[in-house]
């Protein structure tokens, strides 16, 4: 949050409120890892290792998508025709879908520097951190690169296209038993 302006990877100790408080690094200081890479498995590169989405609680992530993330994606796309963009990114199973979703949501691409500050992205990050074992740890060690690049949110046509792709990936994530087209 805005209150948490401390040096990266440090926490400051305070007394107060009758309980205990320790302020950690803020999300400003902790941007996600960024890699220009296309994935076809359920793995995400995280420095020297890959994050495997296989053991996530898919039903709880699906519930979070249906109740709130989907609405934020629609809000972001408001004013755009649903036929405006073709879906070019696909996924074959739930771990693979989450790999693609995390890549498109958090990795900067040409023409769309960052979606990570958007509400749907914050909620996606929270859902993965909460219901994918060990995912939060990969975020603690993530690079600081985005901190400088994410001062303002700019909606470009490329970003709209990217979010359109995300909507397709999420829809596919929610229908894991469908045969791949």
């Amino acid at each position: 949050g805005l209150n948490d302006i401390f040096e990266a990877q440090k926490i400051e100790w305070h007394e107060g409120g009758g309980g205990s408080e320790q302020k950690l690094i803020s999300e400003e200081d902790l941007g996600s890892s960024h890699h220009h890479h296309h994935h076809s498995s359920g793995l995400v590169p995280r420095g020297s290792h890959m994050y495997d989405f296989t053991n996530c609680d898919f039903e709880k992530i699906k519930a979070a998508y249906l109740s709130t993330i989907s609405k934020d994606l629609i809000t972001y796309m408001s004013g755009t025709k649903s036929t405006e963009f073709n879906n070019t990114v696909s996924c074959s199973n739930r771990p693979h879908c989450l790999t693609e979703i995390q890549s498109l949501t958090f990795n900067p691409t040409a023409g769309c520097a960052s979606l990570a500050k958007e509400m749907f992205a914050m909620k996606t990050k929270a859902a993965l951190a909460i219901w994918c074992p060990g995912y939060s740890e990969t975020q603690i060690n993530a690079t600081q690169a985005m901190k400088k690049a994410r001062k303002s949110k700019v909606t470009t046509n490329k970003c709209l296209e990217q979010v359109s792709q995300l909507q397709g990936l999420w829809r596919r994530f929610n229908r894991p038993l469908l045969k791949q087209q």
Epitope: G19, Q22, S26, K125, A129, I130, P133, S136
Partner: antibody, heavy 120, light 107 residues
Amino acid sequence: QVQLVQSGPEVKKPGSSVKVSCKASGYIFTDYAMHWVRQRPGQDLEWMGTFIPLLDTSDYNQNFKGRATITADKSTSTAYMELSSLRSEDTAVYYCARMGVTHSYVMDAWGQGTLVTVSS
Amino acid sequence: EIVLTQSPGTLSLSPGERATLSCRASQHISRSVHWYQQKPGEAPRLLIYFASQSISGIPDRFSGSGSGTDFTLTISRLESEDFAVYYCQQSYSFPYTFGRGTKVEIK
């Protein structure tokens, strides 16, 4: 400055319910989940569950499923933990603790604790 | 459910001595372990997060190490205020669990 202020001590009869509150201030409420942890007299810490304001959802330790209900009022930045069908072994100090959900990911601020005594 | 086993249950040491506390997980949890200190009548206080990440304001005599299933909290030179109960906790997956604690007492 971050503060988590919990409601006062409670004495309850077996079979009844208790609702403990935890008022947060000094940070953006939706950036953090609110976890509930209890500690029975002379015992270790036991995670009960959490409410995630950003996603408007809760998750529970199966040991408390059906008996514990964790909610929050985002307008007042207050989290609640209600425990029903109380028995003597629910006598404990109940803590709320925040945990970042898009950063930090650890329980870095705790309430002062609420002692709940279950006795006939 | 991931079980965390702390050892020893009690550690009797003198001020100035080194304390080594162990926490073993029942399955691989990478580095998703945090250490807390608790004194009587107080809420737990975070000391180390994600196995070895230090916290400004926490004395640097506290350090953490380990990954996978075996984790260690080390207090290099015990001060009088360090005598307390120490808990490890995992946030690798729900349900979050705590170890049973190690009491560090004055010898």
